[in-house]
């Protein structure tokens, strides 16, 4: 017998929903002398599968259809000259979180 | 005003290091049968927070990198086949210390 | 486990040029700075270049400034060390060295690769 | 540039016994952000050198409680207060404060 119950969960589970991904602060503000700490933090991103774009779509993708910016307190850690003493403070980062998403097509047939 | 100097001591501390942990011998060893004096013993396990692994990495954990037995001098008790009493030994017990830490991922997402 | 494997050494003559390689694993490379020690013959320590953990910043003591260039490649995990106008007072054993950020301090270090300048 | 002046040149010590380094360094080695970047570094024979104490008294992790790190200013001090055999070879201390970072001569421990 199947659990309908549970089968839905897992729908909801793989289908295209923000969820929480890692995000490494350097690669998303492109800082690369910079050092953060944590250096990743946990954002909600679209994520999982599209079942169903139009009947022609090639390609259907998960993307964001709601983005907000939200602030996150961070200790940034700089080189200063010479090879000691980096330079630290505390620093409010804005990272994007994805609060609704949608399946849309990226890539439609010919036909 | 926030010191840099004990938040930066306060990440080394949280961030993912090997650290002391009590661990009981009887667990450790799985000997139900057998009591151990001291019961616990101090051993050095990975412990802490990992900021990164992979950009699509869902759960990064701890894990050790580099592990080495110590051995232990405890005292063991035993219940005597047959008879009343208990059989004390002195004994030396092979307890995993964790010498390197490094942050893993085990769960990567679809993305 | 955290490895630094240096290559590249060489007998070069006065005056030559030589590039050094340090192969880093076990850790995520582009999050550290790195840098370049040399032990000289007399066993004396002398730091030769540290690099940021994104390849921008630089520093270099008067002694090789102008002559030896540090960089880096991320995607390789790999530190380099290009030295020009070698002179016999550079004959070492050259180290890299990780740059700890939260500790500040160089961490781990090479087993290191011999350089000797002699015509 | 900072002189770093290590003593004794050569320390021979009984395994067991408290093994005290001293560095000096010809100013001071505070850093204009008000930490002390003063390292000790042990090499073995064969060895690269590992790094046993940071910012004058912070063990480095893995490095046994019987080595400790003191001292300010321009006077620091290595202290092993048991020498086991594993602990022999040459001691460096470093100063990171100032450009160019330098380090000491070395102290060779060797045993008695």
């Known amino acids: 017998v199947v659990d309908l119950n549970l089968l839905t969960e897992e729908v909801r589970l793989y289908s295209c929903t923000p969820r929480n991904f890692s995000v490494s602060i350097r690669e998303e503000l492109k800082r690369t002398d910079t050092i953060f700490w944590p250096g990743c933090l946990l954002v909600k991103r679209c994520g999982g599968n599209c079942a169903c774009c139009l009947h022609n779509c090639n390609e259907c993708q998960c993307v964001p259809s709601k983005v907000t910016k939200k602030y996150h307190e961070v200790l940034q850690l700089r080189p200063k000259t010479g090879v000691r003493g980096l330079h630290k403070s505390l620093t409010d980062v804005a990272l994007e979180h994805h609060e609704e998403c949608d399946c849309v097509c990226r890539g439609s047939t010919g036909g | 005003v926030v010191d840099l100097n004990l938040l930066t001591e306060e990440v080394r501390l949280y961030s993912c290091t090997p650290r002391n942990f009590s661990v009981s011998i009887r667990e450790e060893l799985k000997r139900t049968d057998t009591i151990f004096w001291p019961g616990c013993l101090l051993v050095k396990r990975c412990g802490g927070n990992c900021a990164c692994c992979l950009h699509n990495c869902n759960e990064c954990q701890c894990v050790p990198s580099k592990v080495t037995k110590k051995y232990h001098e405890v005292l063991q008790l035993r219940p005597k086949t047959g008879v009343r009493g208990l059989h004390k030994s002195l004994t030396d017990v092979a307890l995993e210390h964790h010498e390197e830490c490094d942050c893993v991922c085990r769960g990567s997402t679809g993305g | 486990e955290v490895q630094l494997v240096e290559s590249g050494g060489d007998l070069v003559k006065p005056g030559g040029s030589l590039k050094l390689s340090c192969a880093a694993s076990g850790f995520t490379f582009s999050n550290y700075g790195m840098s370049w020690v040399r032990q000289t013959p007399d066993k004396r320590l002398e730091w030769v270049a540290t690099i940021g953990s994104g390849g921008h910043y630089t520093y270099y003591p008067d002694s090789v400034k102008g002559r030896f260039t540090i960089s880096r490649d991320s995607a390789k995990s790999t530190l380099y060390l290009q030295m020009s106008s070698l002179k016999s007072e550079d004959t070492a054993i050259y180290y890299c060295?990780?740059?700890?950020?939260?500790?500040?301090?160089?961490?781990?270090w090479g087993q290191g690769t011999t350089l000797t300048v002699s015509s | 540039d900072v002189l770093m002046t290590q003593t004794p040149l050569s320390l021979p010590v009984s395994l067991g016994d408290q093994a005290s380094i001293s560095c000096r360094s010809n100013q001071s080695i505070v850093h204009s952000n008000g930490d002390t970047y003063l390292e000790w570094y042990l090499q073995k024979p064969g060895q690269s050198p590992k790094l046993l104490i940071y910012?004058?008294?912070n063990r480095f992790s893995g490095v046994p409680d019987r080595f400790s790190g003191s001292g300010s200013g321009t006077d620091f001090t290595l202290k092993i207060s048991r020498v086991e055999a594993e602990d022999l070879g040459v001691y460096y201390c470093f100063q990171g404060s100032h450009v160019p970072p330098t380090f000491g001569g070395g102290t060779k421990l060797e045993i008695k």
């Open positions: 060295a990780r740059q700890a950020p939260l500790w500040d301090c160089s961490d781990y």
């Open positions: 910012k004058v008294s």
